[in-house]
């Protein structure tokens, strides 16, 4: 089928980089400049993506290969192939659609980006809170109030014995 | 081709106004969120504001509340930046852009972007 396609069609021997030119009697002909055609046998070429505003150039565009994008310092890229780029806050804050906010109490972000999620409520595991949480961090838990209770066996074992004169790593 | 042009830079005294205008084309301009950004010399990207479809939504960054007024015109596919009481702290490129399908609900990326206009804030 491939051959006789090719017989028939003589836009499937124009390679990547070029277009089957209807107006040139179908021959190849080079995609004409900030366009591409990745692929053979394209009865045109696809203009080439324009990384502005926030978004950077990654990779440039080539007669057979799209521009590539990714965002500027201070955003980060969402979609497939960064299509879209949305702004970062700082860790402590979630981005809502009127800019970056602080957690509420409860509730942390450890990261640039992402929602505030609610601090691991250590009760749920019978544990108890060891460390309180803040707005850029998770609370740790500890171990339950049962274990902590006066005559308990330590949670922690002791700390094997050191050869004198060795400091911990 | 879808496409954002702002207008409207230019030089302005400290406590003049000027108003920015971004054309919209190639898109359905009345279904998509529009934001304002920002970038001072030698600064990062800023949001200054943004709008939802209808205009009945309008957010600002602090430093411009009751300074500044975003507002959409959709049947003239056109959003504009209101900017009175300005200081030379806003000295800046001016961008328009697209909120990203499912902004608002799902992420607050945007997709399009224009060339930017100049604002110099100076006496």
């Known amino acids: 089928f491939e051959r006789t396609r090719s017989l028939q069609d003589p836009c499937s021997n124009c390679p990547a980089g070029t277009f089957c030119d209807n107006n040139r009697n179908q021959i190849c002909s080079p995609c004409p400049p900030n366009s591409f055609s990745s692929a053979g046998g394209q009865r045109t070429c696809d203009i080439c993506r324009q990384c502005k505003g926030v978004f950077r150039t990654r990779k440039e565009c080539s007669s057979t290969s799209n521009a590539e994008c990714d965002c500027t310092p201070g955003f980060h890229c969402l979609g497939a192939g960064c299509s879209m780029c949305e702004q970062d806050c700082k860790q402590g804050q979630e981005l809502t659609k009127k800019g970056c906010k602080d957690c509420c109490f409860g509730t942390f972000n450890d990261q640039k980006r992402g929602i505030c999620r609610p601090w691991t409520n250590c009760s749920l595991d019978g544990k108890s809170v060891l460390v309180n949480g803040t707005k850029e961090r998770d609370v740790v838990c500890g171990p339950s109030p049962a274990d902590l209770s006066p005559g308990a066996s330590s949670v922690t074992p002791p700390a094997p014995a050191r050869e004198p004169g060795h400091s911990p790593q | 081709e879808v496409q954002l042009v702002e207008s409207g830079g230019g030089l302005v005294q400290p406590g003049g106004s000027l108003r920015l205008s971004c054309g919209a084309s190639?898109?359905?301009?009345?279904?998509?969120?529009m934001l304002w950004f920002r970038q001072a010399p030698g600064k990062g990207l800023e949001w200054v504001a943004n709008?939802?479809?209808?205009?009945?939504?309008?957010y600002y960054v602090d430093s411009v509340k009751g300074r500044f007024t975003i507002s959409r015109d959709n049947a003239k596919n056109s959003l504009s930046l209101q900017m009175n009481s300005l200081r030379a702290e806003d000295t800046a490129t001016y961008y328009c852009?697209?909120?990203?399908?499912?902004?608002?609900?799902?992420?607050?990326?945007?997709?399009?972007w224009g060339q930017g206009t100049t604002v110099t804030v100076s006496s």
């Open positions: 709008i939802n479809q209808d205009g009945s939504e309008k």
């Open positions: 190639g898109f359905t301009f009345s279904t998509y969120w």
């Open positions: 852009a697209r909120g990203g399908d499912g902004y608002s609900d799902s992420h607050f990326g945007t997709d399009v």
